[in-house]
């Protein structure tokens, strides 16, 4: 309950915060749990305690372990634990999952990526930023204070972003890197009364007797994820499944999201071996959502065979 996980890379600075909070004037004692050995407060040590903070300048793989902090208040002592893991630097570009900080989401309107844990360090701007190990260049990227701003965010901007900065302690500089994933989410969606794109209202569809015919019902419902949206076909006001004609079946087409962000659905009506009686039916394309229902009616007509006689 009073434990927090911290991690870092060998030869980089790592600063860890005691999970128990107290007043700035409270004394905080730190111990290495395995040996119960007190962590010194003298800054000349590579690992030293500074109030609520435990500093590894720089960190070594052997520093990994559980550290205990005790916040001494006037009436009781609060004990917390910092579970520290120091990893070897990877030779390749990939950042393993165990080194990743929490994923953040952005959108066209809000594309800030905060550099994780940076508030613990004594750093000066600017930060360096990398995406999938490549240094970010171009006017779309702006390093501002402790975060990166991306202008005109696109889905391709999703990926792993690493911030790199220098921690200064008593005139000595130490490198720090931190990586987190960035995902791009759609702007807040909205819902509209359904708009049927096809077929046109009262369309006449020419078909050939004995051949197969397809009718597509296509409608759009708004932008972004839709809570309730459906398209379907009816025959003479009856659902296809209830109509009982095995030659006539409907199957879902592709869910579409156009470049303008509209959320649309398709339903294809497949008529096998078109018969004369099919021309007498009324085919209704229905689109419905929370706003209501829209219906476009189609009728079939016989396609005149091409006259080959002169």
């Amino acid at each position: 309950k009073f434990s927090k996980q911290s991690w870092g890379l060998e030869n980089e600075a790592l600063i860890v915060r005691c999970p128990r909070q107290g007043k700035p004037s409270y004394t905080v004692d730190w111990y290495y749990s395995q040996t119960n050995k007190s962590i010194p407060t003298q800054e000349r040590n590579r690992v030293f305690a500074s109030g609520q903070l435990l500093k590894f300048l720089p960190a070594a793989v052997a520093d990994s372990g559980i550290y205990t902090c005790i916040v001494r208040s006037p009436t009781f002592n609060r004990t917390g634990y910092a579970n520290v893991t120091i990893y070897k630097k990877q030779s390749d570009c990939n950042v393993p999952d165990y080194l990743m900080y929490s994923t953040v989401s952005g959108s066209e309107k809000n594309s800030k990526i905060y550099c994780p844990t940076i508030d613990l360090y004594n750093w000066t701007a600017p930060l360096e930023w990398f995406k999938n190990c490549q240094a970010l260049q171009g006017s779309r990227y702006r390093a501002h204070k402790s975060f990166l701003v991306i202008d005109n965010v696109m889905t391709e901007d999703a990926g792993d972003y690493t911030c790199k900065f220098i921690h200064n302690e008593n005139g000595a500089n130490y490198s720090v890197t931190a990586t987190r994933s960035f995902t791009v989410k759609d702007e807040q969606g909205f819902s509209l009364f359904p708009v049927i794109g096809a077929p046109a209202q009262n369309e006449i569809k020419e078909v050939e007797i004995g051949k197969n015919a397809n009718l597509t019902c296509s409608a759009c419902f708004g932008k972004g994820t839709q809570f309730l949206a459906a398209v379907l076909w009816q025959l003479n006001g009856t659902k296809i499944t209830d109509f009982g004609e095995p030659r006539i079946q409907q199957e879902e087409g592709q869910n579409q999201s156009f470049s303008n962000g509209l959320a649309c659905l398709d339903m294809v009506l497949r008529i096998a071996d078109v018969k004369e009686e099919d021309l007498l039916l009324q085919y209704d394309c229905l689109a419905l959502n929370l706003h209501g229902l829209r219906r476009h009616t189609v009728r079939l007509s016989r396609k005149n065979p091409i006259d080959h006689h002169s």
Epitope: F2, R20, K23, R72
Partner: antibody, heavy 116, light 113 residues
Framework: QVQLVQSGAEVKKPGASVKVSCKAS????????MNWVRQAPGQRLEWMGW????????TYGDNFKGRVTITRDTSASTAYMELSSLRSEDTAVYYC?????????WGQGTLVTVSS | DIVMTQSPDSLAVSLGERATINCKSS????????????LAWYQQKPGQPPKLLIY???TRESGVPDRFSGSGSGTDFTLTISSLQAEDVAVYYC?????????FGGGTKVEIK
């Protein structure tokens, strides 16, 4: 600069619950605990409890245990105080105040009126 | 719980004169671990949240005029306004910042005579 902005005034019926929010800005939210203090009309200030914003551990004053719930959302840098089973004596201004050596930063206050 | 008792309840002082407010705690607010007295003083004006003036019994919060000073140790504490100004008209509270539950005094109303 440090700012604590609280949600607006509420009018509640006896027996109901109220949830007050306190959005922090101008500092790293998880670095400091958040206290809740209330002030009934003509009464002294009364400490309700606080939350360790780093690990989410709350501590409640004895007078409020069982009725108060203090939570936080680190992604929104916001602390919340929910008081249940409201009675007319709970009519008060509720403040959030940042922990430190005493309370140097306070929210503007949220007036909660309990009336049938 | 630590009970904080303030005196007087109200105080009328001429502009430029000294105002003294006392606060007594039912238990010592001195922490032997660091020799700090965990007592704070606040000023509150109508319709506003309290404003921290003094913490640690005698440390002035940054931005607070130096006419405000705090003293005392253990269970007896004093807030002094050396030369009262018109803007100092308010209610003043002492607070136990030592142990839970943090408790406040009943307040002292300072007015101009």
């Amino acid at each position: 600069q440090v700012q604590l902005v609280q949600s607006g005034a509420e009018v509640k019926k006896p027996g109901a619950s109220v949830k007050v929010s306190c959005k922090a800005s101008g500092y790293t939210f998880i670095n400091y605990g958040m206290n809740w203090v209330r002030q009934a009309p003509g009464q002294r200030l009364e400490w309700m409890g606080w939350i360790n914003t780093y690990i989410g551990e709350p501590t409640y004053g004895d007078n409020f245990k069982g009725r108060v719930t203090i939570t936080r959302d680190t992604s929104a840098s916001t602390a919340y105080m929910e008081l249940s089973s409201l009675r007319s004596e709970d009519t008060a201004v509720y403040y959030c105040a940042r922990e430190g050596d005493a309370f140097a930063y306070w929210g503007q206050g949220t007036l909660v009126t309990v009336s049938s | 719980d630590i009970v904080m008792t303030q005196s007087p309840d109200s105080l009328a002082v001429s502009l430029g004169e000294r105002a003294t407010i006392n606060c007594k705690s039912s238990q010592s607010l001195l922490y032997s671990g660091n020799q700090n007295n965990y007592l704070a003083w606040y000023q509150q004006k109508p319709g506003q949240p309290p404003k921290l003036l003094i913490y640690g019994a005698s440390t002035r919060e940054s931005g607070v005029p130096d006419r405000f000073s705090g003293s005392g140790s253990g269970t007896d504490f004093t807030l002094t306004i050396s030369s009262l100004q018109a803007e100092d008209v308010a209610v003043y509270y002492c607070q136990n910042d030592h142990s839970y539950p943090y408790t406040f005094g009943g307040g002292t109303k300072v007015e101009i005579k």
